[in-house]
């Protein structure tokens, strides 16, 4: 059975290039594409020099001068992505240090909940998005980003941290989700698969996309990441699916062309500043939103996830470069770095648009099972 062709106006149809998104049988997730629910790989860790620093190592974020008017975020710990080996597992390897979360990886002991109890929480990420069940919420207005078009200087740090490739963002990138929900961007990173195997973290009706970008933000209500961890809305992540398209994506090429320089785990390079917003879809008005967690230890909850309806197109060569260039721990390729989807446990995913109404001519108009009571502008 083929999934219905996704139109631009239907959930997750059409990338930034305006292409339609036909999902054929070959795109349906197979068993081996779907990490087991009981032992998923993970995502967002909060590393410092040696992955997760202790609380005393988290720098305080002091406002810069009035004239510059932004918070000093460049040294904050990050929220990053781990890997999913051929047999994805919800296990993190610890070195002999014991209980700290600084040296987890996939495929080893102990189970993540022993590394961080929050990993066994009820409201974890990523999740499977079922547009038919999403609650249309008119109060979810278009996202607004400010300061995301960066000049070439100063250069930015691009790092292979063994779990993902991460770009540290400078101070001054602001994101608004609505009243009382203003954020500053900290970093972005990617999740991907392997040859012929998709590697997005979130899925849509079970469909896994080739890759996914996450832009991680700290609420302006908090000066430090450690203060925000576990607090509702303390962190927010913008997520977008990456798909294969006919043309090279020039924005992504500015990063992908530098991956060979950081092939080795722990290596980093400096790249010129770029238009960060160009890495995201162009439609900021249509998205899904829910409250979840970081997807690696410490798996802290309270993270606001915003998943764009529109996808971003990369060429086949670019997707191959992403999945086939970097190396992770233990002489293993850095591939399949996504966590299995987690149960919603009663959570309702909200949509900024009526996602439950499928524009496919073959689909009967569905009943919207969930609703959002909040009013719009």
């Amino acid at each position: 059975q083929r999934l219905p062709r996704m139109q631009e106006d239907s959930p997750l149809g059409g990338g930034s290039s305006g292409e339609d998104d036909p999902l054929g049988e070959e795109d349906l997730p197979s068993e081996e594409d779907s990490p087991r629910e009981e032992d998923p790989p993970g995502e967002e860790d909060l590393p410092g020099e040696e992955d997760l620093p202790g609380e005393e190592d988290l720098p305080e974020v002091k406002p810069k001068s009035e004239e510059e008017g932004s918070l000093k975020l460049e040294d904050l710990p990050t929220v990053e992505a781990p890997g999913d080996p051929q047999e994805p597992q919800n296990n993190a390897h610890r070195d002999k240090e014991g209980d700290d979360q600084s040296h987890w990886r996939y495929g080893g002991d102990p189970p993540w909940p022993r590394v961080s109890p929050a990993c066994a929480g009820r409201f974890q990420s990523p999740v499977d998005i079922r547009p038919q069940l999403a609650a249309f919420c008119p109060a979810l207005r278009p996202l607004e980003l400010l300061g995301f078009q960066l000049p070439p200087l100063p250069e930015l740090r691009l790092r292979n941290n063994g779990h993902s490739v991460q770009l540290t963002l400078p101070p001054g990138l602001e994101m608004a989700l609505g009243p009382g929900r203003e954020y500053r961007a900290l970093q972005l990173h990617l999740h991907w698969g392997a040859a012929g195997r998709p590697g997005s973290e979130h899925t849509v009706e079970g469909h896994r996309f080739p890759a996914e970008i996450h832009v991680v933000h700290l609420s302006t209500a908090f000066a430090r990441v450690d203060e925000a961890l576990g607090r509702p809305g303390g962190l927010a992540v913008l997520a977008a699916f990456l798909e294969e398209g006919p043309e090279e994506n020039s924005a992504y090429e500015q990063l992908l062309s530098r991956l060979e320089e950081i092939a080795e785990e722990g290596s980093e390079t400096q790249v010129p500043g770029l238009d960060i917003s160009a890495l995201l879809p162009s439609d900021f008005s249509r998205y899904f939103q829910y409250e979840g967690s970081l997807t690696t230890p410490p798996c802290a909850q309270g993270v606001i996830w915003t998943v764009f309806n529109q996808t971003v197109m990369l060429s086949a060569k670019q997707l191959h470069t992403l999945s086939d260039t970097l190396w992770g721990p233990g002489d293993s390729r850095l591939q399949l770095n996504f966590r299995a989807t987690q149960p919603l446990n009663g959570r309702v995913i909200e949509a900024s648009f009526p996602a439950g109404v499928d524009s496919s001519p073959r689909a009967a108009e569905p009943v919207q099972l969930n609703s959002c009571l909040a009013a719009g502008d």
Epitope: P142, E144, A176, L177, G178, P179, G180, E182, F284, S285
Partner: antibody, heavy 119, light 107 residues
Amino acid sequence: EVQLVESGGGLVKPGGSLRLSCAASGFTFSNYYMSWVRQAPGKGLEWVAAINSDGGITYYLDTVKGRFTISRDNAKNTLYLQMNSLRAEDTALYYCARHRSGYFSMDYWGQGTLVTVSS
Amino acid sequence: DIQMTQSPSSLSASVGDRVTITCKASQNVVSAVAWYQQKPGQAPRRLIYSASNRYTGVPDRFSGSGSGTDFTLTISSLQAEDLADYYCQQYSNYPWTFGGGTKVEIK
């Protein structure tokens, strides 16, 4: 009803100072970013400065940096613009503007106060 | 700084005409564009935010479109009360910048 009322404009000599005020009412002032925007006589609009909801972060147009200071008193529901080292090219009608709640776009404007810098 | 180039600088049209004003950004501003109307002797009034979203209370003859660098404000059927200056503004990067304005006159 949202109301923004500017005051403090007037005639000042080059190099002089003025302090503009904007009294806000009809909304929870402390929840909103605020801006000052100016319009020279017969000309277009020019954004001057902005301030976040708690007053901790400010932004300025390059040509006023170091001369103008935007501030706010949330207890008094008032926005301020302290203007020092005024120049002839600062002559304009100065508007106070509120930003959409939780966003960066501006949605309400006052009627403006005229600042004239002339010897 | 991001330049917002607005055109035309002025236009004259009859009541009922369709009027289009364009704004071109010097670099990508995604959808962070607002449109304002300023009637003679008055403060600017909000019309559109996020390129295409009409504010509550704004007549539906006003519509906005575009993303990236090219944006359009359309008045589908010009009314006498639409005589005003119209400005686009980007709020994607500091400093926020406005277009030079378009004066709309009624024939």
